[in-house]
């Protein structure tokens, strides 16, 4: 999971205002137990800061110690700062918790850059703006780290919401969500609405603004418009899905669909960008460049390393194409597509020199570990992680940033043959994309 490239936060732009929650009629299948349509206590429970992820408030221990925890669907450990660190305002103090139990086992998690290590234990955990339950969960108490915590990010730990297969040190360490479902009546499902601001926010705006919602145990119908479309979870490790086609402004990239999923495609709230395999990235950039050729952008921009700016309020959104990813559907030979706007893949960046310009980074980047559908994708949609039925749902988010001409979309069905062939069969190795 990659932190440090995106503040996805919303402050009232685009879509219905978050404060307005109207019940809607829906033509969806009948709801299962626990999937009621309103979760008022959980709506707006996420906050975030640019490039630094979305976090939820959690409490650990007895008496409860409050911490902000990064919501990460690309990893599977619940890990919290448990020792003083220059970037932490607060940390988990195990010695103050009467319910802490030491597992007498260490854990070491190296990343492409940086690492964290700590001591495993269990304690009582709850989510104040979540279900009204307390669970005993595994906690990695981080005692040492390098380039993990982010200065000013306002989070002190990470909640890995993926499956046990990628938990560290091994798959015997039960992830938090598994513990939650086992110990309570919370249905085996959660949903995320990540709300991008569409403009950079300073520290005080971040703390005062809403970043989105994590609905634990259900689906809140006020958070999306239209229908939810589901794609199968290919394998329960990361939230792995299969992309069957990619279009730029309706033009098919015409690549062998295996390339789109080489070596996997995952949905990861802890990554900022839409990350694409090298060949796919190069083809996509070539197509986006061609579509936006009325303006010439610096080479560094397409690498995500250089800003482009326009006079405030004059960003020419219309010259940039929409990007559609077709995902395998639940029915044989059926797919659906999710479409994002430049408002999602051009990331607003604070320009320290002047407020007269709106500046952006290109938030699509190259990957050597497959496609990562990070915040760039997720900010367009309400995403349902339906673990019980081994599927992920997408609907247009009520808070996505758009303009008067175009909106993000989830559309289907489309006939697509031989979709199973699009999946790549990865050689078995112990790998994790944590922070890559």
């Amino acid at each position: 999971t990659q932190h440090g490239i995106r503040l996805p936060l919303r402050s009232g732009l685009g879509g219905a205002p978050l404060g307005l929650r109207l019940p809607r009629e829906t033509d969806e299948e009948p709801e299962e137990p626990g999937r009621r349509g309103s979760f008022v206590e959980m709506v707006d429970n996420l906050r975030g800061k640019s490039g630094q992820g979305y976090y939820v408030e959690m409490t650990v221990g007895s008496p409860p110690q409050t911490l902000n925890i990064l919501v990460d669907t690309g990893s599977s450990n619940f890990a919290v700062g448990a020792a003083p660190h220059p970037f932490l305002h607060r940390y988990y103090q195990r010695q103050l918790s009467s319910t802490y139990r030491d597992l007498r086992k260490g854990v070491y998690v190296p990343y492409t850059q940086g690492k964290w290590e700590g001591e495993l234990g269990t304690d009582l955990v709850s989510i104040p703006h979540g279900p009204n339950v307390t669970v005993r969960a595994n906690i990695a108490a981080i005692t040492e780290s390098d380039k993990f915590f982010i200065n000013g990010s306002n989070w002190e730990g990470i909640l890995g919401l993926a499956y046990a297969e990628i938990a560290r040190p091994d798959d015997s360490l039960e992830p938090f969500f598994d513990s939650l479902v086992k110990q309570t009546h919370v249905p085996n499902l959660f949903s995320l609405q990540l709300c991008g601001a569409g403009f950079p926010l300073n520290q005080s705006e971040v703390l005062a603004s809403v970043g989105g919602s994590m609905i634990i145990g259900g689906i809140d119908h006020s958070l999306y418009t239209g229908s939810l479309w589901y794609t199968p979870i290919r394998r329960e490790w990361y939230y792995e899905v299969i992309i069957v086609r990619v279009e730029i402004n309706g033009q098919d990239l015409k690549m062998d669909c295996k390339e789109y999923n080489y070596d996997k495609s995952i949905v990861d709230s802890g990554t900022t960008n839409l990350r694409l395999p090298k060949k796919v990235f190069e083809a996509a950039v070539k197509s986006i460049k061609a579509a936006s050729s009325t303006e010439k952008f610096p080479d560094g921009f397409w690498l995500g390393e250089q800003l482009v700016c326009w006079q405030a309020g004059t960003t020419p959104w219309n010259i940039f194409p929409v990007i559609s990813l077709y995902l395998m559907g639940e029915v044989t030979n059926q797919s659906f597509r999710i479409t994002i706007l430049p408002q999602q893949y051009l990331r607003p960046v604070e320009d320290v020199a002047t407020s007269q310009d709106d500046c952006y980074k290109f938030a699509i980047s190259q990957s050597s570990t497959g496609t990562v559908m990070g915040a760039v994708i997720m900010e367009g949609f309400y995403v349902v992680f339906d673990r019980a039925r081994k599927r992920i749902g997408f609907a247009v988010s009520a808070c996505h940033v758009h303009d008067e001409f175009r909106t993000a979309a989830v559309e289907g069905p489309f006939v697509t043959l031989d979709m199973e062939d699009c999946g790549y069969n990865i050689p078995q190795t112990d790998e994790s994309t944590l922070m890559t």
Epitope: Q306, L307, C359, S365
Partner: antibody, heavy 117, light 107 residues
């Protein structure tokens, strides 16, 4: 405070290779690119190449065949390697931190490389 | 490659002068033009980035302007410490390139 410090061999024999390191502090190599620039005695600045925050590299087209730039993010070091040195590669070699507008906003003090037998 | 051509060097100046150094690119560089100062001791500093933005800590007597292929650096009231060599640099297209430099010399 952002700092960059080059360190090189000083003297290199013709046809041999050059290795220079640039140790940085005050910023993360995963967030910002680092460029290499050289200046032969009494001449102007010549751009050699860049290693981007994301890890990709680009080079001066005239030198691409014998130039290689790499980095170690965890050690905050950037490396320049150049093969088959000739006397006209004698120069002051600088590393510089890149900003998000394509400017090189902090430079190292440079390291002198003399190619001579 | 984009070729950057600077004002002929050296340039004879007097303290207190308003000095303008020009730089021409062989193709449109969309304002991704930077100016650097190199002191006689070899120290290089960024002065102006993105055509006209003053780098932090740089005195306000330095300014930049231009668009397309033509750019300039102006020092409004030349001081002794400004006697140095100035380079333009395009940050638009890889491979990035520098101008040949303009050395200021006191008359």
């Amino acid at each position: 405070e952002v700092k960059l410090m080059e360190s090189g061999p000083g003297l290199v024999a013709p046809s041999q290779s050059l290795s220079i390191s640039c140790t940085v502090s005050g910023f993360s190599l995963t967030s910002y690119g680092v460029d290499w620039v050289r200046q032969p005695p009494g001449k102007g600045l010549e751009w050699l190449g860049v290693v981007w925050g994301g890890g990709s590299t680009n080079y001066n087209s005239a030198l691409m065949s014998r130039l290689s730039i790499s980095k170690d993010n965890s050690k905050s070091q950037v490396f320049l390697k150049m093969n088959s040195l000739q006397t006209d590669d004698t120069a002051m070699y600088y590393c510089a931190k890149r900003d998000y507008f394509g400017g090189l906003n902090v430079w190292g003090t440079g390291t002198t490389v003399t190619v001579s037998s | 490659d984009i070729v950057m051509t600077q004002t002929t060097s050296p340039l004879s100046v007097s303290l207190g002068d308003r000095v303008t150094i020009s730089c021409r690119a062989s193709q449109d560089i969309s304002k991704y033009l930077n100016w650097y100062q190199q002191r006689p001791d070899g120290t290089v500093k960024l002065l102006i980035y993105y055509t006209s933005r003053l780098h932090s800590g740089v005195p306000s007597r330095f300014s930049g302007s231009g668009s397309g292929t033509d750019y300039s650096l102006t020092i409004s009231n030349l001081e002794q410490e400004d006697i140095a060599t100035y380079f333009c640099h395009q940050g638009h297209k890889i491979p990035y390139t520098f101008g040949g430099g303009t050395k200021l010399e006191l008359k």
